[in-house]
């Protein structure tokens, strides 16, 4: 990707329906710079076209450098209101920024994933709940729409609804993070 990212390094089951999640603190607990690829090892790339960024899912030529994304991880309190026991779980949420001032955002109306320029504090649409999966993959669940995940559809990123009772291992919502 042509633009450089100004990275400010800090020293430092599904979302229940109707749950309220408050991001604790405005600073991420940690950040990392990583390339993003699909379960099938296709790369997620970003290209500036007509003054806006497009997101592609593609096979990269061997010599082509993978685009990096700044992942900022936030803790959010997860009140255990269902059981009434008051136990606060921690939900790990992430924002993804492939270039300075641009963040991946969920467009729930269009079922799409878009890159938008925005200022902090970031909108809820830019936050995704991080899930561990098998094969050292992760999934990204929309904070604003529990049960909806970033996925791959027709060589693009899209929002994909996953049934709560289904196996969340479906390949199209699995991603690999690589810091190398």
């Amino acid at each position: 990707m042509g633009s450089s990212h100004h990275h400010h390094h800090h020293s430092s089951g599904l979302v229940p329906r109707g749950s309220h999640m408050s991001i604790t603190g405005i600073s991420p607990i940690t950040e990392s710079l990583a390339s993003l690829s699909t379960y099938n090892d296709q790369s997620i790339t970003f290209a500036l076209e007509d003054e806006s960024y497009e997101i592609y899912v593609e096979d990269l030529k061997k010599d082509k450098k993978k685009d990096k994304v700044l992942l900022s991880y936030y803790e959010s309190q997860h009140p255990s209101s269902e059981s009434g026991d008051g136990v606060d779980g921690k939900m790990l949420m992430v924002t993804l920024s492939p270039t300075k001032d641009f963040w991946l955002q969920a467009n729930n109306k269009e079922h799409s994933v878009e890159l938008h320029k925005c200022e902090k504090p970031l909108p809820d649409q830019a936050f995704f709940v991080l899930h561990n999966r098998s094969f050292n993959c992760v999934s990204f669940e929309c904070k604003t729409d529990p049960g909806v995940f970033i996925g791959v559809k027709d060589n693009h990123l899209a929002l994909i609804k996953v049934d709560y009772s289904e196996n969340l291992g479906s390949e199209n919502i699995l991603f690999k993070l690589s810091e190398t």
Partner: antibody
């Protein structure tokens, strides 16, 4: 108060089987990744297996892959570890552990059971 | 698999001492490292997560730092209840792996 209580340990011959259970209470069990971690007598900690909140994703240590199966019954707030083809080197205290993060193991394990001893010997 | 190497394997110290334990990962793990304390016959207790975040209820004399491959756990002023074995654990990728442990003993 969060409680994790393991059961099912005991003495078993090499090649035998055991099923460990972990009864959970005090938190919304189905929301959390759960794991098994073991500790051989006088040794360090070894992660065994993890399972996602809905049971859809599982991960295993290479040393137990194909022999152990992790599962959960969210209606009964119970975690299981089915252990087959047991070997002497599986002898350990087995701990059930709750992830600090609801949907991820990235934050470590904040609650552990008291452990149940599995002894594999002839 | 990611190997976690802890040092020292044991340390003798007195109440009030500052104790530092190090943990090295065989490859980068970002900040996905946890520290645990274990006393004989008991289950481990989470002290630090995400390399430097103090777990709720843990005294502030415990602190963690580091990222990538090098991490430290520091006890600023050792208390009698701190004599125990300490383990680091990488949480970056499966299989999750622990360091070999550091036993903090009374001098």
């Amino acid at each position: 108060e969060v409680q994790l209580v393991e059961s099912g340990g005991g003495l078993v011959q090499p090649g035998g089987s055991l099923r460990l259970s972990c009864a959970a209470s005090g938190f919304t069990f189905s929301s959390y990744v759960m794991s098994w971690v073991r500790q051989a007598p006088g040794k360090g900690l070894e992660w065994v297996s993890s399972i996602s909140g809905n049971g859809g994703s599982t991960n295993y240590a290479d040393s137990v892959k194909g022999r152990f199966t992790i599962s959960r019954d969210n209606s009964k707030n119970t975690l299981f570890l089915e252990m087959n083809s047991l070997r002497a080197e599986d002898t350990a205290v087995y701990y059930c552990a709750k992830s600090l993060g609801t949907t991820t193991t990235f934050l470590g394990f904040d609650y552990w059971g008291q452990g149940t001893l599995v002894t594999v010997s002839s | 698999d990611i190997q976690m190497t802890q040092s020292p394997s044991s340390v003798s110290a007195s109440v009030g001492d500052r104790v530092t334990i190090t943990c090295r990962a065989s490859q980068g793990i970002s900040s996905w490292l946890a520290w645990y304390q274990q006393k004989p016959g008991k289950a481990p207790k989470l002290l630090i997560y995400a390399a430097s975040s103090l777990q709720s209820g843990v005294p502030s004399r415990f602190s963690g730092s580091g990222s990538g491959t090098y991490f430290t756990l520091t006890i600023s002023s050792l208390q009698p209840e701190d004599f125990a074995t300490y383990y680091c654990q990488q949480a970056n990728s499966f299989p999750l792996t622990f360091g070999g442990g550091t036993k903090v003993e009374i001098k």
